[in-house]
């Protein structure tokens, strides 16, 4: 067979689906690799071919589209399972070709089992809700295209193991779940199960997501530098180790990049000819406010180093702040035998 542009195994698309549920999987060629869509390809006389490699096998085989009740079918650029079976797990390849052109890509499909409380090896999307912010909604994800708009599915929402009913602040509203006001206690896994009929059969779609309640933008402030501050003086003798922590609190801000850095005499530590190391640690509150600590360390400080300016800087989407550390050379305590005696006029 002639050459084929092989995009390899697209591990970015690690598709996970539940056993015994419908799954519709679009050929990734048109979404990520080619600059034209399926309709254009089809009208240009290109054919889309599917095949697969079973889990723990090397042999590529055609997909059996003649199973009872059309369990596996293809529609345009979509591969359909109605429903999946555990042994459908494997690497699937879609190939677009005619006599002069060929392009293909493979992707892994994993069929997973869930337990009675919807726990599974499935990687869960995280949805962030602002604490005490007013009405916010989550929507049952990835259910588009499974049934026509004329079909009215039933949707049941669960928190963990339990149907959501008679909750004070959480109300199921069809495909949406409304949080009248979100609290830390609303953290957890939420599952929607969509049930719909098709050709005399009933199908179910289970979708679980993790809700994380985070700090509200109403309460967000610019970065706050707790250390260094005006109450602490770093007094060292030459030869001692100088350790200065820069501790900064950042309010949670969606998609904000929090940055902390030191300058020494207005320059980055890397641009100064001294042996300085900086260690960073990060901790988070329950609402994902962040505290970053960067410890500036000079193992054996010189008297020159003790004259320098050490400034901690911090930046977030809310603003930029800076604070200088007060660094001094320790004045040696007087030695009695010489200095004190001289002071008393001894000869």
């Amino acid at each position: 067979s002639e050459r084929c542009d092989d995009w390899g195994l697209d591990t970015m698309r690690q598709i996970q689906v539940f056993e015994d549920e419908p799954a519709r999987i679009k050929c990734p060629l048109f979404e990520h690799f080619l600059k034209f869509n399926y309709s254009t390809a089809h009208s240009a006389g290109l054919t889309l071919i599917w095949y697969w490699t079973r889990q723990d096998r090397d042999l590529e085989e055609p997909i059996n589209f003649r199973l009872p009740e059309n369990r596996i079918s293809k529609e345009k650029d979509v591969l359909w399972f109605r429903p999946t079976l555990l042994n459908d797990t494997g690497n699937y390849t879609c190939m677009l070709r005619n006599t002069t052109y060929c392009s293909k890509v493979a992707f892994p499909l994993e069929v997973v089992q869930k337990d009675s409380c919807f726990n599974s090896p499935m990687k869960l999307p995280v949805h962030k809700l602002y604490i005490e912010y007013g009405i916010q909604r989550i929507t049952c994800p990835n259910v588009d295209g499974y049934f026509p708009s004329s079909v009215k599915p039933t949707i049941t929402w669960y928190m963990g193991c339990y149907k959501i009913q008679n909750f004070n602040n959480v109300i199921p509203e069809g495909m949406n779940l409304s949080f009248l006001i979100a609290f830390i206690s609303n953290n957890g896994n939420y599952t929607c199960v969509v049930t719909y009929p098709e050709n005399g059969r009933t199908f179910h779609l289970t979708r679980t997501l993790t809700v994380k309640v985070v700090g509200s933008p109403k309460n967000a402030v610019p970065p706050v530098i707790h250390s260094p501050n005006d109450h602490v003086v770093y007094e060292k003798e030459p030869g001692e180790e100088l350790l200065i922590p820069c501790t900064v609190y950042f309010s949670f801000l969606m998609d904000s990049r929090n940055e902390v850095w030191w300058t020494i005499d207005g320059k980055k530590p890397d641009d100064i000819p001294i042996d300085v190391t900086i260690n960073e640690s990060i901790s988070h509150s329950r609402t994902e406010d962040e505290t970053r600590t960067q410890i500036l360390s000079i193992k054996k400080v010189t008297s020159e180093d003790l004259k320098r300016s050490y400034v901690c800087h911090a930046r977030s989407a809310k603003g930029e702040v800076a604070k200088a550390a007060t660094v001094k050379q320790k004045v040696p305590a007087p030695r009695y035998t010489v200095e004190l005696a001289c002071g008393f006029g001894a000869t």
């Epitope: 539940f18 056993e19 015994d20 429903p83 079976l85 555990l86 089992q113 869930k114 337990d115 009675s116 409380c117 039933t154 049941t156 149907k163 009913q165 008679n166 199960v193 049930t195 009933t202 179910h204």
Partner: antibody, heavy 117, light 107 residues
Framework: QVQLVQSGAEVKKPGSSVKVSCKAS????????MNWVRQAPGQGLEWMGR????????HYAQKFQGRVTLTADKSTSTAYMELSSLRSEDTAVYYC??????????WGQGTLVTVSS | DIQMTQSPSSLSASVGDRVTITCSAS??????LNWYQQKPGKAPKLLIH???GLHAGVPSRFSGSGSGTDYTLTISSLQPEDVATYYC?????????FGGGTKVEIK
């Protein structure tokens, strides 16, 4: 298509036990609840309990707690209901009913258990 | 346990009639209500789930409605094959409980 085939009718003595089987096919046995419901002659339906074969999680009606045991064998896709300390009022048709969620979508044909001395 | 009360316990209607069966719960069940049909000597069959969701393959003459504690099953045009006993069942709170049943006959 979903099929639930139950074991045959049983005649039991008071104080003994009965074990009814329900063999499932046409769906993923591990991923659905298997319920057990009974119906005394000429009476209504009474839910006894359910099991999730995937993890063995069970829920029982208080009335049957301690007297009924639900089990499932994933290798043969078979669910079992064992009822002990039988009395005459346990004479009934016992049904298994499969449900992906809580509704019982599909039912077995029923097993008549007669308790008589 | 939640008590389910069905009425009437039996009814007789003519072919083509509109038939209504009601089911009342002892407390709110948030639409978590199923309707089953049981023909003589047969196992029950699911007709409607979650108050109004028609189970696959069930004729559209069957419909369900209601909220809170009160629910209704309607057969818009009674057919001879609809002769059966109909049960409501709540699945809001364990244990699941059934109504006493409504026997539907043809006049």
């Amino acid at each position: 298509q979903v099929q639930l085939v139950q074991s045959g009718a049983e005649v039991k003595k008071p104080g003994s036990s009965v074990k009814v089987s329900c063999k499932a096919s046409g769906y993923a046995f591990s991923s659905s609840w298997m319920n057990w419901v009974r119906q005394a002659p000429g009476q209504g339906l009474e839910w006894m309990g359910r099991i999730y074969p995937g993890d063995g999680n069970t829920h029982y009606a208080q009335k049957f707690q301690g007297r009924v045991t639900l089990t499932a064998d994933k290798s043969t896709s078979t669910a079992y209901m064992e009822l002990s300390s039988l009395r005459s009022e346990d004479t009934a048709v016992y049904y298994c009913g499969e449900g992906y969620l809580d509704p019982m979508d599909y039912w077995g044909q029923g097993t008549l258990v007669t308790v008589s001395s | 346990d939640i008590q389910m009360t069905q009425s009437p316990s039996s009814l007789s209607a003519s072919v083509g009639d509109r038939v209504t069966i009601t089911c009342s719960a002892s407390q709110g069940i948030n639409n978590y209500l199923n309707w089953y049909q049981q023909k003589p000597g047969k196992a029950p069959k699911l007709l409607i789930h979650y108050t109004s969701g028609l189970h696959a393959g069930v004729p559209s003459r069957f419909s369900g409605s209601g909220s809170g504690t009160d629910y209704t099953l309607t057969i818009s045009s009674l057919q001879p094959e609809d002769v059966a006993t109909y049960y409501c069942q709540q699945y809001s709170i364990l244990p699941w409980t059934f109504g006493g049943g409504t026997k539907v006959e043809i006049k």
